[in-house]
Amino acid sequence: DAHKSEVAHRFKDLGEENFKALVLIAFAQYLQQCPFEDHVKLVNEVTEFAKTCVADESAENCDKSLHTLFGDKLCTVATLRETYGEMADCCAKQEPERNECFLQHKDDNPNLPRLVRPEVDVMCTAFHDNEETFLKKYLYEIARRHPYFYAPELLFFAKRYKAAFTECCQAADKAACLLPKLDELRDEGKASSAKQRLKCASLQKFGERAFKAWAVARLSQRFPKAEFAEVSKLVTDLTKVHTECCHGDLLECADDRADLAKYICENQDSISSKLKECCEKPLLEKSHCIAEVENDEMPADLPSLAADFVESKDVCKNYAEAKDVFLGMFLYEYARRHPDYSVVLLLRLAKTYETTLEKCCAAADPHECYAKVFDEFKPLVEEPQNLIKQNCELFEQLGEYKFQNALLVRYTKKVPQVSTPTLVEVSRNLGKVGSKCCKHPEAKRMPCAEDYLSVVLNQLCVLHEKTPVSDRVTKCCTESLVNRRPCFSALEVDETYVPKEFNAETFTFHADICTLSEKERQIKKQTALVELVKHKPKATKEQLKAVMDDFAAFVEKCCKADDKETCFAEEGKKLVAASQAALGL
């Protein structure tokens, strides 16, 4: 369905409000350092142009591609070279190379100030004074800090953000109403960003086939009653949506996502019995709800997998005729029977099955060769099961903070070259797997834990890719998407690491720590712990625990002192000396 004017087509499909919001997100995700006002100006210019094309699709430039229109607009920014350096060279290229160039310059860790939340009354005044600008600013600030945030989902977050202010700014206790809602949106937003980042990494680093395999496994678990052909159609459509969003084609992505939600709801009888409530909601809520919907019940009468995939004489014939279709069917059949497995485990099993068929279908007696293929699955299944059991026991014993500390030590010893802020951020997130997943029954633990760990380890991979500092991280991140977690789990202490010098400044603390939130105080202590391990990678758990206990006592003591600053100065020196002695520094 070719349109004379792509920009007019998308404007009409999406409506002015969503069109403007999505163009703002797109621009902020590309030019992450540009001021808000500059972006608003660019968006308004694009919107006015789109309206002329709606009025007359034959008007000048209306036939240009969205990449051409948007790229030309971005390249009008006067300070491009000063602000972005070599990214300005993108503007010398032609499409599609120019867009690829912009994509390559997206920064997962932009040098932007932390978002500080103003007082509730200040926020409510700003909201009432100019609601439109207030909400645009939210989109802009999130998009520039999360350049791969799933744009249609960000519209859903903005809708909830608006609803929170609309409700709470009229409440008797504004803060009690608003702050928990904003905390929830912040935490959900970070999780949503990280999940989408993995989808984009999967597509960009490992290709469409890898993403499709992931989607087959996940959708088959979620919709086990759907036929393989139905799942395949959904996978194809979902792949298109995410390819578009990850490629910066946000208008097409949002439009296609809406079409996919419409299709799913029109065909829910052949997809899942769990979609009814989702499909009664408005568009943004509907799409979000479908993406999060619980797994449908498994059909009761599913036959054994062995018949079609091991015992049949036609295995090699079926495999040879259409390899990816046959492997897709295997993955579909295995996944719909195993909602208790993680997606990455299902993909490892499919890869093992594929490798076995590649080898055996060329053998003298193929059936004899692949007859025991399912036996090879047992250790692959047991490895994550055992790991999750051990780590959930440790989490239950230690609690979240100390469990995070155990992971901080573990990962700093594995990859000590990684920057301290990255190690703290990643290990804290790894540690959250305990409270997120260990409360679940056995049947839900593995999909919760291992698929969450895949998302967190991808954060490490994308941050490390910007500035590679460790071959071990590069290897685990690039060799196999589905084996990243086992690869990191298998790493031992890095014996090639040259320990960092002891620097007393790193362990000097001031009274300002006393006014920090509990979370920020934890981060300070965890930063010190990482630095300790970098100085003394061979330190035992007991040594590190003793130093950290002394440190916690020191902070507590000085925060209660009348002259806090003097306490931190004098007691701090003693603590540093005692720690050096305890660790043999």
Epitope: Q417, V418, S419, T420, T467, P468, V469, S470, D471, R472, T474, D494, T496, Y497, V498, P499, K500, E501, N503
Partner: nanobody, 117 residues
Framework: QVQLVESGGGLVQPGGSLRLSCAAS????????MSWVRQAPAKGPERVSA????????IYADSVKGRFTISRDNAKNTLYLQMNSLKPEDTAVYYC??????????PGQGTQVTVSS
């Protein structure tokens, strides 16, 4: 933007000396251990030497022990490699990297060292 610019390479006779420099910018140089890595034609990268963030800890590949010395000047954001008693097998492109990576950390092209009579 991380930038690592290597210099000081050249053509030298066996037994001769060279001093390589690596000027760093775009990151907190003094916070990171650094490495010198070399890649000879048709061979994989080899980590020659590494130094801790403050400069007191060093390690060397067996093939260069006693001949090469790594050092750094954190005030100047510069890493050095003093190469003495050079051998033909030291011929390679030498580049500096952050941490223990053998992947070039920035757009630097490395510096060519050729040992030949």
């Amino acid at each position: 933007q991380v930038q690592l610019v290597e210099s000081g390479g050249g053509l030298v006779q066996p037994g001769g000396s060279l001093r390589l420099s690596c000027a760093a910018s775009g990151f907190t140089f003094g916070q990171f251990g650094m490495s010198w890595v070399r890649q000879a034609p048709a061979k994989g990268p080899e980590r020659v030497s590494a130094i801790s963030s403050g400069g007191s800890g060093t390690i060397y590949a067996d093939s260069v022990k006693g001949r090469f010395t790594i050092s750094r000047d954190n005030a100047k954001n510069t890493l050095y490699l003093q190469m003495n008693s050079l051998k033909p097998e030291d011929t390679a492109v030498y580049y500096c990297t952050i941490g223990s990576s053998t992947t070039p950390s920035g757009p630097g092209q490395g510096t060519q060292v050729t040992v030949s009579s």
